[in-house]
Protein backbone atom coordinates (compact mmCIF):
# COMPACT_ATOMS: atom_id res chain seq x y z
CA UNK A 1 0.00 0.00 0.00
CA UNK A 2 1.46 3.37 -1.03
CA UNK A 3 1.55 5.98 1.72
CA UNK A 4 -0.60 9.02 1.00
CA UNK A 5 1.65 12.09 0.62
CA UNK A 6 1.08 15.47 -1.01
CA UNK A 7 2.20 15.81 -4.61
CA UNK A 8 5.45 17.79 -4.86
CA UNK A 9 5.20 21.19 -6.50
CA UNK A 10 5.22 21.08 -10.30
CA UNK A 11 4.77 17.31 -10.45
CA UNK A 12 0.98 17.12 -10.83
CA UNK A 13 0.29 15.08 -13.98
CA UNK A 14 -1.57 17.07 -16.65
CA UNK A 15 -1.59 14.08 -18.97
CA UNK A 16 -0.42 10.48 -19.02
CA UNK A 17 3.01 10.64 -20.62
CA UNK A 18 6.44 9.03 -20.50
CA UNK A 19 7.76 11.31 -17.78
CA UNK A 20 5.57 9.39 -15.29
CA UNK A 21 7.76 6.30 -15.57
CA UNK A 22 10.41 8.15 -13.55
CA UNK A 23 7.91 8.96 -10.76
CA UNK A 24 8.35 7.04 -7.53
CA UNK A 25 5.39 4.96 -6.39
CA UNK A 26 4.21 7.52 -3.86
CA UNK A 27 4.48 10.28 -6.47
CA UNK A 28 2.28 8.31 -8.87
CA UNK A 29 -0.25 7.87 -6.08
CA UNK A 30 -0.17 11.55 -5.13
CA UNK A 31 0.22 13.19 -8.53
CA UNK A 32 -1.88 11.17 -10.98
CA UNK A 33 -5.62 11.77 -10.92
CA UNK A 34 -7.65 8.56 -11.29
CA UNK A 35 -10.15 10.18 -13.69
CA UNK A 36 -7.28 11.39 -15.90
CA UNK A 37 -5.85 7.88 -15.84
CA UNK A 38 -9.20 6.37 -16.87
CA UNK A 39 -9.66 8.74 -19.81
CA UNK A 40 -6.10 8.22 -21.07
CA UNK A 41 -5.75 4.47 -20.52
CA UNK A 42 -4.72 4.03 -24.15
CA UNK A 43 -1.48 5.88 -23.30
CA UNK A 44 -0.67 3.74 -20.27
CA UNK A 45 0.12 0.66 -22.32
CA UNK A 46 2.53 2.66 -24.48
CA UNK A 47 4.62 3.46 -21.40
CA UNK A 48 6.70 0.54 -20.06
CA UNK A 49 5.78 0.98 -16.40
CA UNK A 50 7.22 -1.56 -13.97
CA UNK A 51 4.71 -3.94 -12.40
CA UNK A 52 5.26 -2.11 -9.09
CA UNK A 53 4.11 1.10 -10.75
CA UNK A 54 1.20 -0.71 -12.41
CA UNK A 55 0.10 -1.83 -8.93
CA UNK A 56 -0.29 1.83 -7.99
CA UNK A 57 -2.26 2.61 -11.15
CA UNK A 58 -4.51 -0.40 -10.56
CA UNK A 59 -5.17 0.79 -7.01
CA UNK A 60 -6.28 4.17 -8.37
CA UNK A 61 -8.65 2.55 -10.90
CA UNK A 62 -10.05 0.23 -8.22
CA UNK A 63 -10.91 3.25 -6.07
CA UNK A 64 -12.52 5.03 -9.01
CA UNK A 65 -14.51 1.97 -10.15
CA UNK A 66 -15.29 -0.20 -7.09
CA UNK A 67 -18.11 -1.96 -8.99
CA UNK A 68 -15.86 -2.91 -11.90
CA UNK A 69 -14.15 -1.09 -14.76
CA UNK A 70 -16.08 0.18 -17.78
CA UNK A 71 -15.23 -1.40 -21.12
CA UNK A 72 -13.56 1.81 -22.33
CA UNK A 73 -10.92 1.25 -19.63
CA UNK A 74 -10.78 -2.56 -19.95
CA UNK A 75 -9.97 -2.39 -23.66
CA UNK A 76 -6.77 -0.46 -22.98
CA UNK A 77 -5.49 -2.29 -19.90
CA UNK A 78 -2.55 -3.90 -21.69
CA UNK A 79 -0.03 -5.21 -19.15
CA UNK A 80 -2.26 -3.98 -16.37
CA UNK A 81 -4.54 -6.92 -17.24
CA UNK A 82 -1.89 -9.27 -15.86
CA UNK A 83 -2.34 -7.60 -12.47
CA UNK A 84 -6.08 -8.34 -12.38
CA UNK A 85 -7.46 -11.15 -10.25
CA UNK A 86 -10.35 -13.39 -11.36
CA UNK A 87 -12.41 -11.56 -8.69
CA UNK A 88 -11.70 -8.23 -10.41
CA UNK A 89 -12.66 -9.65 -13.79
CA UNK A 90 -15.95 -11.09 -12.53
CA UNK A 91 -17.10 -7.51 -11.98
CA UNK A 92 -16.62 -6.65 -15.66
CA UNK A 93 -19.11 -6.64 -18.49
CA UNK A 94 -17.09 -7.28 -21.65
CA UNK A 95 -19.20 -7.29 -24.81
CA UNK A 96 -16.78 -6.24 -27.56
CA UNK A 97 -14.74 -8.85 -29.39
CA UNK A 98 -12.08 -6.16 -29.90
CA UNK A 99 -11.72 -5.84 -26.12
CA UNK A 100 -11.39 -9.60 -25.78
CA UNK A 101 -8.73 -9.71 -28.51
CA UNK A 102 -6.78 -6.85 -26.94
CA UNK A 103 -6.61 -8.63 -23.59
CA UNK A 104 -5.81 -12.05 -25.07
CA UNK A 105 -2.96 -10.42 -26.97
CA UNK A 106 -1.33 -9.47 -23.66
CA UNK A 107 -1.28 -13.14 -22.63
CA UNK A 108 -0.35 -14.43 -26.09
CA UNK A 109 2.03 -17.38 -26.23
CA UNK A 110 1.40 -18.40 -22.64
CA UNK A 111 -0.88 -20.97 -21.07
CA UNK A 112 -4.40 -19.90 -20.26
CA UNK A 113 -4.28 -18.17 -16.88
CA UNK A 114 -7.17 -18.13 -14.38
CA UNK A 115 -7.65 -14.47 -15.36
CA UNK A 116 -8.03 -15.33 -19.04
CA UNK A 117 -10.34 -18.26 -18.27
CA UNK A 118 -12.55 -15.93 -16.20
CA UNK A 119 -12.51 -13.27 -18.92
CA UNK A 120 -13.56 -15.77 -21.59
CA UNK A 121 -16.29 -17.17 -19.35
CA UNK A 122 -17.68 -13.66 -18.72
CA UNK A 123 -17.55 -12.84 -22.41
CA UNK A 124 -19.22 -16.05 -23.64
CA UNK A 125 -21.93 -15.88 -20.96
CA UNK A 126 -22.60 -12.28 -21.96
CA UNK A 127 -23.06 -13.30 -25.59
CA UNK A 128 -25.28 -16.24 -24.73
CA UNK A 129 -23.54 -18.60 -27.14
CA UNK A 130 -20.14 -19.35 -28.60
CA UNK A 131 -20.55 -17.70 -32.00
CA UNK A 132 -18.18 -18.21 -34.93
CA UNK A 133 -16.20 -14.97 -34.51
CA UNK A 134 -15.62 -15.64 -30.82
CA UNK A 135 -14.60 -19.23 -31.46
CA UNK A 136 -12.29 -18.08 -34.27
CA UNK A 137 -10.61 -15.66 -31.87
CA UNK A 138 -10.34 -18.06 -28.95
CA UNK A 139 -8.95 -20.99 -30.93
CA UNK A 140 -6.44 -18.67 -32.63
CA UNK A 141 -5.02 -17.75 -29.21
CA UNK A 142 -5.66 -21.10 -27.49
CA UNK A 143 -5.87 -24.06 -29.88
CA UNK A 144 -6.96 -26.32 -27.01
CA UNK A 145 -9.77 -24.00 -25.92
CA UNK A 146 -12.63 -26.04 -27.34
CA UNK A 147 -11.50 -29.19 -25.52
CA UNK A 148 -11.39 -27.31 -22.21
CA UNK A 149 -15.17 -26.89 -22.32
CA UNK A 150 -17.59 -29.34 -20.75
CA UNK A 151 -20.07 -31.20 -23.00
CA UNK A 152 -22.78 -28.95 -21.54
CA UNK A 153 -20.87 -25.81 -22.53
CA UNK A 154 -20.16 -27.25 -25.98
CA UNK A 155 -23.86 -27.73 -26.54
CA UNK A 156 -24.15 -23.94 -26.87
CA UNK A 157 -21.82 -23.93 -29.89
CA UNK A 158 -23.94 -23.30 -33.01
CA UNK A 159 -23.17 -25.54 -36.02
CA UNK A 160 -22.10 -22.48 -38.02
CA UNK A 161 -19.20 -21.97 -35.59
CA UNK A 162 -17.77 -25.38 -36.45
CA UNK A 163 -16.30 -23.89 -39.63
CA UNK A 164 -13.79 -22.05 -37.42
CA UNK A 165 -12.45 -25.29 -35.89
CA UNK A 166 -9.09 -26.61 -37.08
CA UNK A 167 -7.98 -30.25 -36.59
CA UNK A 168 -5.41 -29.23 -33.95
CA UNK A 169 -8.17 -27.56 -31.92
CA UNK A 170 -9.61 -31.02 -31.22
CA UNK A 171 -6.36 -32.78 -30.28
CA UNK A 172 -7.13 -32.92 -26.58
CA UNK A 173 -10.90 -33.52 -26.81
CA UNK A 174 -12.24 -36.66 -25.15
CA UNK A 175 -15.04 -38.87 -26.59
CA UNK A 176 -17.74 -37.12 -24.56
CA UNK A 177 -16.82 -33.80 -26.11
CA UNK A 178 -16.65 -35.25 -29.61
CA UNK A 179 -20.08 -36.82 -29.09
CA UNK A 180 -21.44 -33.28 -28.76
CA UNK A 181 -19.36 -31.74 -31.55
CA UNK A 182 -19.79 -34.44 -34.19
CA UNK A 183 -23.53 -33.90 -34.88
CA UNK A 184 -22.89 -30.17 -35.16
CA UNK A 185 -20.06 -30.78 -37.63
CA UNK A 186 -22.21 -33.18 -39.64
CA UNK A 187 -24.88 -30.50 -39.89
CA UNK A 188 -22.36 -27.76 -40.72
CA UNK A 189 -20.72 -29.71 -43.56
CA UNK A 190 -23.80 -31.51 -44.89
CA UNK A 191 -23.84 -29.69 -48.24
CA UNK A 192 -20.25 -30.59 -49.17
CA UNK A 193 -19.39 -33.31 -51.66
CA UNK A 194 -17.84 -36.65 -50.59
CA UNK A 195 -14.10 -36.01 -50.53
CA UNK A 196 -14.38 -32.42 -49.27
CA UNK A 197 -16.85 -33.53 -46.62
CA UNK A 198 -14.49 -36.22 -45.36
CA UNK A 199 -11.58 -33.77 -45.06
CA UNK A 200 -13.71 -31.49 -42.88
CA UNK A 201 -15.48 -34.15 -40.80
CA UNK A 202 -12.39 -36.31 -40.21
CA UNK A 203 -11.24 -34.63 -36.98
CA UNK A 204 -14.74 -34.95 -35.48
CA UNK A 205 -15.22 -38.66 -36.24
CA UNK A 206 -14.40 -39.67 -32.66
CA UNK A 207 -18.07 -38.86 -32.04
CA UNK A 208 -19.52 -40.68 -35.06
CA UNK A 209 -22.04 -43.52 -34.65
CA UNK A 210 -21.81 -46.88 -36.48
CA UNK A 211 -24.31 -45.97 -39.21
CA UNK A 212 -22.24 -42.93 -40.26
CA UNK A 213 -19.07 -45.03 -40.40
CA UNK A 214 -20.90 -47.57 -42.56
CA UNK A 215 -21.99 -44.77 -44.87
CA UNK A 216 -18.42 -43.45 -45.11
CA UNK A 217 -17.16 -46.93 -46.00
CA UNK A 218 -19.18 -46.70 -49.20
CA UNK A 219 -17.42 -43.47 -50.28
CA UNK A 220 -13.79 -44.53 -50.87
CA UNK A 221 -12.55 -42.19 -48.16
CA UNK A 222 -9.29 -44.02 -47.28
CA UNK A 223 -9.37 -43.16 -43.58
CA UNK A 224 -5.92 -43.15 -41.99
CA UNK A 225 -5.14 -45.36 -38.98
CA UNK A 226 -4.69 -42.41 -36.62
CA UNK A 227 -8.30 -41.37 -37.27
CA UNK A 228 -9.55 -44.96 -37.05
CA UNK A 229 -7.88 -45.42 -33.66
CA UNK A 230 -9.79 -42.41 -32.29
CA UNK A 231 -13.20 -43.79 -33.29
CA UNK A 232 -15.62 -44.86 -30.57
CA UNK A 233 -15.14 -48.55 -29.78
CA UNK A 234 -18.90 -49.10 -29.64
CA UNK A 235 -19.22 -47.56 -33.11
CA UNK A 236 -16.47 -49.73 -34.60
CA UNK A 237 -17.53 -53.12 -33.16
CA UNK A 238 -20.56 -53.69 -35.43
CA UNK A 239 -18.56 -52.96 -38.62
CA UNK A 240 -17.90 -55.96 -40.84
CA UNK A 241 -14.45 -56.85 -42.15
CA UNK A 242 -15.52 -55.72 -45.61
CA UNK A 243 -16.72 -52.35 -44.26
CA UNK A 244 -13.48 -51.72 -42.38
CA UNK A 245 -11.51 -52.68 -45.48
CA UNK A 246 -13.49 -50.18 -47.58
CA UNK A 247 -13.26 -47.51 -44.86
CA UNK A 248 -9.46 -47.74 -44.58
CA UNK A 249 -8.66 -48.48 -48.22
CA UNK A 250 -4.88 -48.81 -48.61
CA UNK A 251 -4.43 -48.03 -44.90
CA UNK A 252 -6.00 -51.37 -43.93
CA UNK A 253 -2.50 -52.87 -43.64
CA UNK A 254 -1.96 -50.69 -40.57
CA UNK A 255 -4.42 -52.83 -38.60
CA UNK A 256 -1.70 -55.41 -37.97
CA UNK A 257 0.45 -52.93 -36.02
CA UNK A 258 -2.57 -51.92 -33.93
CA UNK A 259 -4.09 -55.37 -33.31
CA UNK A 260 -3.41 -55.21 -29.56
CA UNK A 261 -4.89 -51.75 -29.11
CA UNK A 262 -8.47 -50.55 -28.84
CA UNK A 263 -10.65 -50.32 -30.85
CA UNK A 264 -8.87 -52.75 -33.22
CA UNK A 265 -8.36 -55.42 -30.54
CA UNK A 266 -12.03 -55.42 -29.52
CA UNK A 267 -13.17 -55.34 -33.14
CA UNK A 268 -11.01 -58.39 -34.02
CA UNK A 269 -12.61 -60.37 -31.18
CA UNK A 270 -16.03 -59.75 -32.76
CA UNK A 271 -15.08 -60.89 -36.30
CA UNK A 272 -15.05 -64.40 -37.74
CA UNK A 273 -11.49 -65.60 -38.18
CA UNK A 274 -12.38 -66.65 -41.75
CA UNK A 275 -13.32 -63.04 -42.58
CA UNK A 276 -10.18 -61.65 -40.95
CA UNK A 277 -8.06 -64.10 -42.98
CA UNK A 278 -9.40 -62.57 -46.20
CA UNK A 279 -7.41 -59.41 -45.37
CA UNK A 280 -4.18 -61.40 -45.56
CA UNK A 281 -2.68 -59.47 -42.65
CA UNK A 282 -2.29 -62.34 -40.22
CA UNK A 283 -4.75 -60.87 -37.74
CA UNK A 284 -5.48 -63.39 -34.98
CA UNK A 285 -8.11 -63.62 -32.26
CA UNK A 286 -11.31 -63.79 -34.31
CA UNK A 287 -14.19 -66.20 -33.67
CA UNK A 288 -13.19 -69.71 -34.82
CA UNK A 289 -15.21 -71.34 -37.59
CA UNK A 290 -18.31 -73.23 -36.46
CA UNK A 291 -18.87 -71.09 -33.35
CA UNK A 292 -22.20 -69.33 -32.90
CA UNK A 293 -22.17 -65.79 -31.46
CA UNK A 294 -25.10 -64.85 -29.26
CA UNK A 295 -25.66 -61.17 -28.69
CA UNK A 296 -27.02 -61.30 -25.14
CA UNK A 297 -27.54 -57.58 -24.96
CA UNK A 298 -29.98 -57.81 -27.87
CA UNK A 299 -31.75 -60.78 -26.19
CA UNK A 300 -32.21 -58.77 -22.99
CA UNK A 301 -33.62 -55.87 -24.93
CA UNK A 302 -36.23 -58.12 -26.55
CA UNK A 303 -37.38 -59.83 -23.32
Amino acid sequence: EVEKTACPSGKKAREIDESLIFYKKWELEACVDAALLATQMDRVNAIPFTYEQLDVLKHKLDELYPQGYPESVIQHLGYLFLKMSPEDIRKWNVTSLETLKALLEVNKGHEMSPQVATLIDRFVKGRGQLDKDTLDTLTAFYPGYLCSLSPEELSSVPPSSIWAVRPQDLDTCDPRQLDVLYPKARLAFQNMNGSEYFVKIQSFLGGAPTEDLKALSQQNVSMDLATFMKLRTDAVLPLTVAEVQKLLGPHVEGLKAEERHRPVRDWILRQRQDDLDTLGLGLQGGIPNGYLVLDLSMQEALS
Epitope: P48, T50, Y51, Y79, L82, K83, V106, G109, H110
Partner: nanobody
Framework: EVQLVESGGGLVQAGGSLRLSCVAS????????MYWHRQAPGNERELVAY???????NVADSVKGRFTISRDNSKNTLYLQMNSLRAEDTAVYYC???????????WGQGTLVTVSG
Protein backbone atom coordinates in the same frame (compact mmCIF):
# COMPACT_ATOMS: atom_id res chain seq x y z
CA GLU B 1 11.48 -17.35 -13.80
CA VAL B 2 14.27 -14.86 -14.63
CA GLN B 3 17.54 -14.48 -12.70
CA LEU B 4 19.65 -11.31 -12.90
CA VAL B 5 23.29 -10.72 -11.95
CA GLU B 6 24.82 -7.24 -12.00
CA SER B 7 28.54 -6.46 -12.22
CA GLY B 8 30.88 -3.57 -13.00
CA GLY B 9 30.46 -1.51 -9.86
CA GLY B 10 33.39 -0.16 -7.86
CA LEU B 11 35.20 2.92 -6.59
CA VAL B 12 35.82 5.70 -9.11
CA GLN B 13 36.99 9.31 -9.01
CA ALA B 14 34.52 12.11 -9.73
CA GLY B 15 34.48 12.75 -13.48
CA GLY B 16 35.39 9.13 -14.19
CA SER B 17 33.45 6.42 -16.00
CA LEU B 18 32.07 2.95 -15.26
CA ARG B 19 30.13 0.42 -17.30
CA LEU B 20 27.63 -1.74 -15.46
CA SER B 21 26.41 -5.05 -16.85
CA CYS B 22 23.40 -7.17 -15.98
CA VAL B 23 23.17 -10.73 -17.31
CA ALA B 24 19.75 -12.37 -17.43
CA SER B 25 19.16 -16.12 -17.35
CA UNK B 26 16.11 -18.38 -17.11
CA UNK B 27 13.05 -17.60 -19.22
CA UNK B 28 14.72 -14.71 -21.03
CA UNK B 29 12.44 -14.99 -24.08
CA UNK B 30 9.64 -13.52 -21.96
CA UNK B 31 11.59 -10.36 -21.04
CA UNK B 32 9.93 -7.21 -22.30
CA UNK B 33 11.50 -4.16 -20.65
CA MET B 34 14.79 -3.93 -18.73
CA TYR B 35 15.53 -1.24 -16.15
CA TRP B 36 18.37 0.26 -14.12
CA HIS B 37 17.44 1.67 -10.70
CA ARG B 38 19.60 3.02 -7.92
CA GLN B 39 19.33 3.53 -4.20
CA ALA B 40 21.64 5.92 -2.38
CA PRO B 41 22.21 5.49 1.37
CA GLY B 42 19.21 6.83 3.30
CA ASN B 43 17.25 7.50 0.10
CA GLU B 44 14.47 5.60 -1.64
CA ARG B 45 15.06 3.68 -4.81
CA GLU B 46 14.72 5.60 -8.08
CA LEU B 47 14.50 4.57 -11.73
CA VAL B 48 17.57 5.65 -13.71
CA ALA B 49 16.92 4.27 -17.20
CA TYR B 50 15.02 1.65 -19.19
CA UNK B 51 15.09 -0.02 -22.58
CA UNK B 52 12.20 -1.93 -24.17
CA UNK B 53 12.35 -5.06 -26.30
CA UNK B 54 11.76 -2.82 -29.32
CA UNK B 55 14.83 -0.77 -28.47
CA UNK B 56 13.06 2.33 -27.15
CA UNK B 57 15.04 3.78 -24.26
CA ASN B 58 15.08 6.75 -21.92
CA VAL B 59 17.08 8.02 -18.94
CA ALA B 60 16.10 10.12 -15.94
CA ASP B 61 16.67 13.88 -16.16
CA SER B 62 19.27 13.71 -13.38
CA VAL B 63 21.61 11.59 -15.54
CA LYS B 64 20.69 12.80 -19.03
CA GLY B 65 23.73 13.41 -21.21
CA ARG B 66 25.94 11.37 -18.87
CA PHE B 67 24.40 7.87 -18.70
CA THR B 68 23.48 5.64 -21.62
CA ILE B 69 21.46 2.41 -21.43
CA SER B 70 21.79 -0.37 -23.99
CA ARG B 71 20.89 -4.00 -24.36
CA ASP B 72 22.34 -6.94 -26.26
CA ASN B 73 19.51 -9.45 -26.73
CA SER B 74 21.84 -12.10 -28.16
CA LYS B 75 23.80 -12.08 -24.89
CA ASN B 76 20.76 -11.41 -22.66
CA THR B 77 22.71 -8.52 -21.22
CA LEU B 78 21.77 -5.01 -20.15
CA TYR B 79 24.38 -2.24 -19.88
CA LEU B 80 24.62 1.16 -18.24
CA GLN B 81 27.45 3.34 -19.45
CA MET B 82 28.09 6.00 -16.80
CA ASN B 83 30.30 8.98 -17.71
CA SER B 84 31.15 12.22 -15.87
CA LEU B 85 30.31 10.57 -12.57
CA ARG B 86 29.48 12.75 -9.58
CA ALA B 87 29.49 12.14 -5.82
CA GLU B 88 25.68 12.13 -5.87
CA ASP B 89 25.73 9.11 -8.23
CA THR B 90 27.02 6.98 -5.34
CA ALA B 91 24.44 4.25 -4.80
CA VAL B 92 23.68 0.57 -5.16
CA TYR B 93 22.61 0.06 -8.79
CA TYR B 94 19.97 -2.58 -9.45
CA CYS B 95 18.83 -4.18 -12.66
CA UNK B 96 15.21 -5.32 -13.01
CA UNK B 97 13.05 -6.74 -15.78
CA UNK B 98 9.40 -6.88 -16.71
CA UNK B 99 8.29 -10.09 -18.41
CA UNK B 100 5.23 -10.88 -20.49
CA UNK B 101 4.47 -14.04 -18.54
CA UNK B 102 4.30 -13.14 -14.88
CA UNK B 103 3.12 -9.87 -13.32
CA UNK B 104 6.04 -9.20 -10.98
CA UNK B 105 9.34 -7.41 -11.51
CA UNK B 106 12.43 -9.59 -11.27
CA TRP B 107 15.43 -8.02 -9.54
CA GLY B 108 19.15 -8.53 -9.28
CA GLN B 109 21.15 -8.26 -6.05
CA GLY B 110 22.70 -4.92 -6.99
CA THR B 111 26.22 -3.61 -7.54
CA LEU B 112 27.74 -0.78 -5.48
CA VAL B 113 29.08 2.32 -7.22
CA THR B 114 31.08 4.74 -5.08
CA VAL B 115 32.19 8.07 -6.54
CA SER B 116 34.85 9.80 -4.45
CA GLY B 117 35.69 13.47 -4.13
Amino acid sequence: EVQLVESGGGLVQAGGSLRLSCVASGRTSTIDTMYWHRQAPGNERELVAYVTSRGTSNVADSVKGRFTISRDNSKNTLYLQMNSLRAEDTAVYYCSVRTTSYPVDFWGQGTLVTVSG
